[in-house]
């Protein structure tokens, strides 16, 4: 069994034209599709082509693209037609450049690392700034110093501990060679120096079936940006949700199967059953995506007796977004932004 079923033939032969001087048409109506959908390589999205006709494997970075053969939206790709002037018919799939950041009036590029001052090293990550402290987390001299105090010393960037003795004369503290220090206090001091940052979850890597979503967070003991992942399933691939849309309606925002079910992953089964909600479909040219969701922890039991747990996207509500594909759509980024309740999860 292939992980995900892939593309219809994409040889970019335009359909016959009445007017040969005009831009080529890559869509034919009525739709002509092969009897069974293609099967995609691992990690390649099976999507509906740009003609809204047939299933195809999404074009990847560096591939040619047309209005029919569209770039993989789950990999942040768009069709760059700039090399095909003046026709703008055949483009190349390119990466959407991440959003830059502005901090204290200074603009930084996506991915750029910088030091806003001598105390922090920061990185711009898709519009948000994550920082890690450069000043060493020196422990306060509790054992022999009754009144430790951190002070700025001229010529030094980082504050240092001084000890206020009975004569109220500050003296610089010496390092102690003792293990009798409360480690919790050190972690708390560390986190006071750490600007906590968690990016929004990325969109699910597949439009149907099991996918993955990632985010970057420095909420850890090292305050170091790490990638977290969670499983996601926006909608089942084997259910034609279009048939469930009531007459006269343009959307079915949420689809929920009647029976509860167990999640399966790599031959392992969830230890309890769930009744998940899925995003539905929109009849017009919009995509149905989660806007109220959270992350739950699902435990799996495997046939060999081993078990593991995974973070999984839990959908509460969905809505029809304006556009799934247009890279110039300023609202398209909403797809990757969860509601506030999710950030706490």
């Amino acid at each position: 069994t292939a992980l995900s079923p892939a593309p219809t033939t994409m040889d970019f032969t335009p359909a016959p034209l009445e007017d040969t001087s005009s831009r080529p048409q890559f869509c034919k109506w009525p739709c002509e599709c092969p009897p069974s959908p293609p099967r995609c390589p691992l990690g390649v999205s099976l999507i509906t082509d740009g003609c809204e006709c047939c299933k195809m494997c999404a074009q990847q970075l560096g591939d040619n693209c047309t209005e029919a053969a569209i770039c993989d939206p789950h990999r942040g790709l768009y069709c760059d037609y700039s090399g095909d002037r003046p026709r703008y018919a055949i483009g190349v799939c390119a990466q959407v450049v991440g959003v830059g950041c502005v901090l204290d009036g200074v603009r930084y590029n996506n991915g750029q690392s910088f030091q806003p001052n001598c105390k922090y090293n920061c990185t711009c990550i898709d519009g948000a700034v994550g920082c890690t402290p450069l000043c060493l987390r020196v422990r306060p001299p509790r054992l022999w110093c009754p009144h430790p105090r951190r002070v700025s010393i001229p010529g030094h960037c980082c504050e240092q501990w001084v000890c206020e003795d009975d004569a109220k004369r500050p003296r610089k503290t010496a390092p102690r060679d003792t293990g009798a220090f409360d480690a919790v206090g050190e972690v708390e001091a560390w986190h006071r120096n750490c600007i906590a940052y968690t990016s929004p979850w990325s969109p699910c890597s597949t439009s149907c079936g099991l996918g993955v979503s990632t985010r970057i967070s420095n909420v850890n003991a090292q305050c170091w940006p790490e990638q977290e992942s969670r499983l996601c399933n926006l909608r089942p691939c084997d259910v034609d949700i279009h048939t469930l849309i009531k007459a006269g309606k343009k959307c079915l925002a949420v689809y929920q199967p009647e029976a509860s079910m167990n999640f399966t992953l790599a031959g392992c089964i969830s230890t309890r059953s769930y009744q998940p909600k899925y995003c539905g479909v929109c009849m017009d040219n919009r995509c149905c995506i989660p806007y109220k969701s959270k992350t739950i922890d699902v435990s799996f039991q495997c046939p060999d007796g081993l078990g593991f747990s995974r973070q999984v996207l839990w959908i509460n509500a969905c809505f029809c977004n304006l556009s799934c594909r247009n890279p110039n759509d300023i609202f398209a980024d909403l797809e990757s932004y969860p509601d506030f309740s999710e950030i706490a999860n």
């Epitope: 033939t9 390589p41 970075l61 990632t214 992942s229």
Partner: antibody, heavy 119, light 110 residues
Framework: QMQLVQSGAEVKEPGSSVKVSCKAS??????LNWVRQAPGQGLEWMGG????????NYAQKFEGRVTITADESTNTAYMEISSLRFEDTAMYYC??????????????WGQGTLVTVSS | QAVLTQPPSVSKGLRQTATLTCTGD????????AAWLQQHPGLPPKVLSY???SRPSGISERLFVSRSGNSASLTITGLQPEDEADYYC???????????FGGGTQLTVL
């Protein structure tokens, strides 16, 4: 630099099983594929897995007799063949796709693991 | 039995040009193109070109790849002794849902 490090050579008896590992440096969201090459023969794709997903993809010929698994935390893929036959004697390669080009999974190759089936 | 068809061997003289061919059908080469691999004896294969005919960095500019319909070709100009190796084409087959290879072409530089 991307690296794929495979486990060492194995000598097995017919009917037994063998499990070969492939540890990849870097991102665990790229497919790791298994390709075998019998002595003096061509390349044959067996299947693949994305460690972060954990769901394998098999060539029809190997379905049922080959099990591909992965450990997401160590970014390691495993390929196990059961009911070994003499004709399974081959060099087994692990190959990872390159950045962005999803239809070219063969940018990075492990050094290969020689599996010999002998009685 | 290899899904993609390649000539078993090609022999050319030093500094000459060799063209290797790979024929498939509309569900593999004709669909998404082919990638080319080079393999020297006792070593793992090495990718020479992507299926969109571009070359990875560090691969000689003496190599040219092209595709027409269901066939792909690899042309090596100014043949050198180090070009003597086995060459394989590979493609994703969207009907089989599998990576497929050619049987390989042994290139001999005389």
């Amino acid at each position: 630099q991307m690296q794929l490090v495979q486990s060492g050579a194995e000598v097995k008896e017919p009917g037994s099983s063998v499990k070969v590992s492939c540890k990849a440096s870097g991102d665990n969201s790229y497919p790791l594929n298994w390709v075998r090459q019998a002595p003096g023969q061509g390349l044959e794709w067996m299947g693949g897995i994305i460690p972060i997903f954990g769901t394998p993809n098999y060539a029809q010929k190997f379905e049922g007799r080959v099990t591909i698994t992965a450990d997401e935390s160590t970014n390691t893929a495993y390929m196990e063949i059961s009911s070994l036959r003499f004709e399974d004697t081959a060099m087994y390669y692990c190959a990872r796709e390159g950045d962005g080009y999803n239809y070219s999974p063969l940018d990075y190759w492990g050094q290969g693991t020689l599996v010999t089936v002998s009685s | 039995q290899a899904v993609l068809t390649q000539p078993p061997s090609v022999s050319k003289g030093l500094r000459q040009t060799a063209t290797l061919t790979c024929t498939g059908d509309s569900s593999n080469v004709g669909n998404q193109g082919a990638a080319w691999l080079q393999q020297h004896p006792g070593l793992p294969p090495k990718v020479l070109s992507y299926r969109n005919n571009s070359r990875p960095s560090g691969i000689s500019e003496r190599l040219f790849v092209s595709r027409s319909g269901n066939s792909a070709s690899l042309t090596i100009t100014g043949l050198q002794p180090e070009d003597e190796a086995d060459y394989y084409c590979s493609a994703w087959d969207s009907s089989l849902g599998a990576w497929v290879f050619g049987g390989g072409t042994q290139l001999t530089v005389l």
